[in-house]
Amino acid sequence: DSSKWVFEHPETLYAWEGACVWIPCTYRALDGDLESFILFHNPEYNKNTSKFDGTRLYESTKDGKVPSEQKRVQFLGDKNKNCTLSIHPVHLNDSGQLGLRMESKTEKWMERIHLNVSERPFPPHIQLPPEIQESQEVTLTCLLNFSCYGYPIQLQWLLEGVPMRQAAVTSTSLTIKSVFTRSELKFSPQWSHHGKIVTCQLQDADGKFLSNDTVQLNVKHTPKLEIKVTPSDAIVREGDSVTMTCEVSSSNPEYTTVSWLKDGTSLKKQNTFTLNLREVTKDQSGKYCCQVSNDVGPGRSEEVFLQVQYAPEPSTVQILHSPAVEGSQVEFLCMSLANPLPTNYTWYHNGKEMQGRTEEKVHIPKILPWHAGTYSCVAENILGTGQRGPGAELDVQYPPKKVTTVIQNPMPIREGDTVTLSCNYNSSNPSVTRYEWKPHGAWEEPSLGVLKIQNVGWDNTTIACAACNSWCSWASPVALNVQYAPRDVRVRKIKPLSEIHSGNSVSLQCDFSSSHPKEVQFFWEKNGRLLGKESQLNFDSISPEDAGSYSCWVNNSIGQTASKAWTLEVLYAPRRLRVSMSPGDQVMEGKSATLTCESDANPPVSHYTWFDWNNQSLPYHSQKLRLEPVKVQHSGAYWCQGTNSVGKGRSPLSTLTVYYSPETIGRR
């Protein structure tokens, strides 16, 4: 059943004498493996014998008989899938039909493949896109219906016989669908490639020529133009004539329209290849070109720069920058239309010629107020001298000059006075708009540039003012020299350096921070009583009774100032100690008796020690000694000792009498 055999392979294969042919082939015999395979050349079915006649190029049978031809022809397939064949070398007389006679256990099949072998290598075929335009990338394809593993070939591209430098991509196909070798070349043609011959050359592995295909490039492009001008340098004077001619060197397709442009703008009614300009004016200076169009688009010539020469026009001055700040740099630029450009300039300041200034620009590195005024210039070229224009005004701005602070009051000034000051200046540009004062204070400015200080402070030493426009200029400070009573009067202990103990030599100093005028007097006072008139108050041997509140006074011609009261503290060991008894010095046994150690001490007593009549210390450290319950045996004389950081003091003896209770008396 022939429907059981399915084959896939190229319908026709192409080769040339001496090359080889590789036949990719697959099959499927559904009833079992292949048992016999014969490759016929031009097989014909013999009805008498029910067999195929023809040249047997290859035979593979169960007995393994192989004809000598088998070395040239190779069956590269297998028993169930692959039927690939190779003929190497292939000969002209191999052209025709190849018949693959396949036999399995129960089935037979004849598959036919066409083989076309030419005498010489056949040419490849160049494929071009339908239209090629300049500068647009195209792909050129060279296709050859041949590929064989045993016969390597190469395809090379040439332009006008010279190898093309662009890299080509070569691909081969040896599949059951197709057999070919292809080369693709990406190429951006220029207008100059139009009409040029492109060749695809087939070569063997050694680069030997085998065949080729050629095509002529048809590159569509805009018109390519050349412009010619008379006179050739395109430099004329006003009133001269100029002729420009436009020539088309190439156009594909043919051109359709012509026009002329000046500075990129089309000139009306100029549609011929010649442009005649008669009695030119300076306005006709500019860049000229011709434009010719075809179906691809417009083409433009190179530009011709027509220069119409004329004498300088009236000049103007540009200032960088006005207004200018004093000390900054300024540049003046003389602007005058002229062709050729001016070669010489004359500069004027307030109508007076500026000597040695002949350049287009004048640079002043450091502007001063006197540089202000009107600047003008005159330009000159080979055709003549221009006129002086209106000029430009330079405004030089600067801070107020020679600022001074002036005290309006009669001198001297006393603390608490009202002081009036004015701020004066010599000149200013722009005008002074405000004033500043240092130091800042809650002061009144009754009018611009006048300061009124009510109740002037002792420490208002100096005042400075500034006159301000865009900048502030400060005057030198003026000294108010305010006179005031002594300040910060205080009592300071000079000796001893540490705390004052009873019996020490003590010196107190009356200090003050400042006084104006400097001549002063001192007064010492304790509890409203005058003690001395020196800056120091001395005690040869201080006693606790000297403790108290001390003040000192310092006065000058303006007034007097008192210190804060200063407490003189005298430290002394406990004194005037005595033992008091509660509820009294006679207590009934069994009750509670409290002995208190009273003393006078500075600092207060920190530690008490109690003693009995035998001077034995009792285990108490507090001011009170509590005996509870008190016993008759506790009767006797007690004394206490007080201790502070200065020393110790002891009380005289105090006698406690403890008498029997009625219960005790009753028991006896």
């Epitope: 530690h607 020690t609 009995d612 009549w613 035998n614 034995q616 210390s617 009792l618 285990p619 450290h621 507090s622 001011q623 009170k624 509590r626 005996l627 016993k631 045996q633 506790h634 006797g636």
Partner: antibody
Framework: EVQLQQSGPGLVKPSQTLSLTCAIS??????????WNWIRQSPSRGLEWLGR?????????DYASSVRGRVSINVDTSKNQYSLQLNAVTPEDTGVYYC?????????????????WGQGTMVTVSS | QSALTQPASVSGSPGQSITISCTGT?????????VSWYQQHPGKAPKLMIY???NRPSGVSNRFSGSKSGNTASLTISGLQAEDEADYYC????????????FGTGTKVTVL
């Protein structure tokens, strides 16, 4: 080496009197630089000073106000010991009772600390 | 007279230092330099560690030190050791009419 040895019952009935004795060895109860103290410890009240006795020219004693009126400390000089008597006890008086010496002179200067302690007596007040 | 105030517990790792505070009033800690510190292991009598604020009795390690500022006394144990785990109490002489001596609430020291 100074040692304090405590003795006395561990169980006392409520309202009865608690009596504990502290025997001194290595020091004298008549020392005029020591005081002899009773201190108790319970979970609820922590360490609590109860009172002291000491001899100078005569005997003195001090008591904490919390027990004043039902406490007395007595001395037996012949046995070199001192004792604590706490009347009308309640379960609140349950705790460990310690005797302790306070040596009040360290050379020539005053000092004050409990430097020697008895071993402690656990007293339970319960019927 | 209320007891002197101590933290209930303080803990530290071996080798570390810890400090226990003891706060009173000007009638006791603040008024006198008679603050003492006691160590008590479970089931044992208290042992004197510091007396008169900062003095150490003979036989007590110099790792124990005391100080006082205002109404607060402090005990510092440096180079903490396992055997230092115990309860610690402070005590002070007081001028209160109800007592002669007052003790602290106690601090449990744990060695981690």
């Amino acid at each position: 080496e100074v040692q304090l040895q405590q003795s006395g019952p561990g169980l006392v009935k409520p309202s009865q009197t608690l009596s504990l004795t502290c025997a001194i060895s290595g020091d004298s109860v008549l020392s005029n630089s020591d005081t002899w103290n009773w201190i108790r410890q319970s979970p609820s009240r922590g360490l609590e000073w109860l009172g002291r006795t000491y001899h100078r020219s005569t005997w003195y004693d001090d008591y904490a106000s919390s027990v004043r009126g039902r406490v007395s400390i007595n001395v037996d000089t012949s046995k070199n010991q001192y004792s604590l008597q706490l009347n009308a006890v309640t379960p609140e008086d349950t705790g460990v009772y310690y005797c302790a010496r306070d040596r009040l002179q360290d050379g020539n200067s005053w000092s004050d600390a409990f430097d020697v302690w008895g071993q402690g007596t656990m007293v339970t007040v319960s019927s | 007279q209320s007891a002197l105030t101590q933290p209930a517990s303080v803990s530290g790792s071996p080798g570390q230092s810890i400090t226990i505070s003891c706060t009173g009033t000007s009638s006791d800690v603040g008024g006198y330099n008679y603050v003492s510190w006691y160590q008590q292991h479970p089931g044992k009598a208290p042992k004197l560690m510091i007396y008169d604020v900062s003095n150490r009795p003979s036989g007590v390690s110099n790792r124990f030190s005391g100080s006082k500022s205002g109404n607060t006394a402090s005990l510092t144990i440096s180079g903490l050791q396992a055997e230092d785990e115990a309860d610690y109490y402070c005590s002070s002489y007081t001028s209160s009419s109800t007592l002669v001596y007052v003790f602290g609430t106690g601090t449990k020291v744990t060695v981690l």
